[in-house]
């Protein structure tokens, strides 16, 4: 994870929940202690884990970049979901940036698909 939230909003209770590992693993929303005796809860809005694990650290929540909107906030078991703002989209080959959608089709072409956060408009040649 390259984008990390450095100013988390902590909604969890001050005391971190603890339980015992099962077969050396801790459940989603937790990480394992250094002595493998406890499962320590991730901090809401700060970090998370999505599956059974033996992580020494929970994973850091992604912070949406400018030009992105937060669709789902980070929980202890799920990372933040960020989406490109309206009028922009994320390309598969350059997923780190949101690019502006084209405003229209070239002459001789018609729009068959609108801009979405995942794709540019789609144009096809006019039937002659």
């Amino acid at each position: 994870i390259t984008r990390q939230s450095l100013d988390p909003q902590r909604r969890a209770a001050p005391q971190q929940k603890r339980s015992s590992p099962t077969e050396g693993l801790c459940p989603p929303g937790h990480h394992i202690s250094e002595d493998s005796r406890e499962c320590i809860s991730c901090k809401y809005g700060q970090d998370y884990s999505t599956h059974w694990n033996d992580f020494l650290f929970c994973l850091r929540c992604t912070k949406c970049d400018s030009g992105e909107v937060e669709v789902n906030s980070c929980t202890t078991t799920r990372n933040t979901v960020c989406q490109c703002e309206e009028g922009t989209f994320r390309e598969e080959d350059s997923p780190e940036i949101c690019r502006k959608c084209r405003t229209g089709c070239p002459r001789g072409m018609v729009k068959v698909k609108d801009c979405t956060p995942w794709s540019d408009i789609e144009c096809v040649h006019k039937e002659s």
Partner: antibody
Framework: EVQLLESGGGLVQPGGSLRLSCAAS????????MSWVRQAPGKGLEWVSA????????YYADSVKGRFTISRDNSKNTLYLQMNSLRAEDAAVYYC??????????WGQGTLVTVSS | EIVLTQSPGTLSLSPGERATLSCRAS???????LAWYQQKPGQAPRLLIY???SRATGIPDRFSGSGSGTDFTLTISRLEPEDFAVYYC?????????FGQGTKVEIK
């Protein structure tokens, strides 16, 4: 009594490889996360890598990521650090330490790695 | 990464005097994940304090740790000849684990 004994250090050319070992005794090795910490001559301490008790999770400093690999053999109570593509700046005393986050409560005596042509 | 800045770089004191060493973090560190170490020339570091204020096994009570958030302090109430060494703070809140650059306590 907890004991950590490093070995495997030595002189290596830039671009070369070394494998460090740390033999542990006096505690339930497989239960504890372990780390490697290094100290260049006349410099401060630098954390290098860490591994969970089971060996399922590993962590690295950016300076060694992609070149060093930490591993452990719990049946032999031994921690390893495979160091590839060694650079002059990797020259240091390498310490094996018990723990990762809250404390490094036991340290080995260190093994010296020299990188020079 | 969390940067730990120790001050002063060098502390020149006489045996019997009080030493106060500071460790400042670039962002908040939970007290649970702040430790102090002592290192003498040619030796491995030795754990002094963990959890910001808990003394490690066998550490004399002249050593004490305090602080929270971004400011932590190691205090040696009365310096003994064997206390002249380099002291490091360390955080384990976030990866990568980081150490301060060290404070050398030398004989005046």
């Amino acid at each position: 009594e907890v004991q950590l004994l490093e070995s495997g250090g030595g002189l290596v050319q830039p671009g070369g490889s070394l494998r460090l070992s740390c033999a542990a005794s006096g505690f339930t090795f497989s239960s504890y996360a372990m780390s490697w910490v290094r100290q260049a001559p006349g410099k401060g301490l630098e954390w290098v890598s860490a591994i969970s008790g089971s060996g399922g999770s590993t962590y690295y400093a950016d300076s060694v990521k992609g070149r060093f690999t930490i591993s452990r053999d719990n049946s032999k109570n031994t921690l390893y650090l495979q160091m590839n593509s060694l650079r002059a700046e990797d020259a240091a005393v390498y310490y094996c330490a018990k723990g990762v986050r809250k404390k490094f409560d036991y340290w080995g005596q260190g093994t010296l790695v020299t990188v020079s042509s | 990464e969390i940067v730990l800045t120790q001050s002063p770089g060098t502390l020149s004191l006489s045996p019997g005097e009080r030493a106060t060493l500071s460790c400042r973090a670039s962002q908040s560190v939970s007290s649970s994940y702040l430790a102090w170490y002592q290192q003498k020339p040619g030796q491995a570091p030795r754990l002094l304090i963990y959890g910001a204020s808990s003394r490690a096994t066998g550490i004399p009570d002249r050593f004490s740790g305090s602080g929270s958030g971004t400011d932590f302090t190691l205090t040696i109430s009365r310096l003994e000849p064997e206390d002249f060494a380099v002291y490091y703070c360390q955080q384990g809140q976030l990866p990568p684990i980081t150490f301060g650059q060290g404070t050398k306590v030398e004989i005046k």
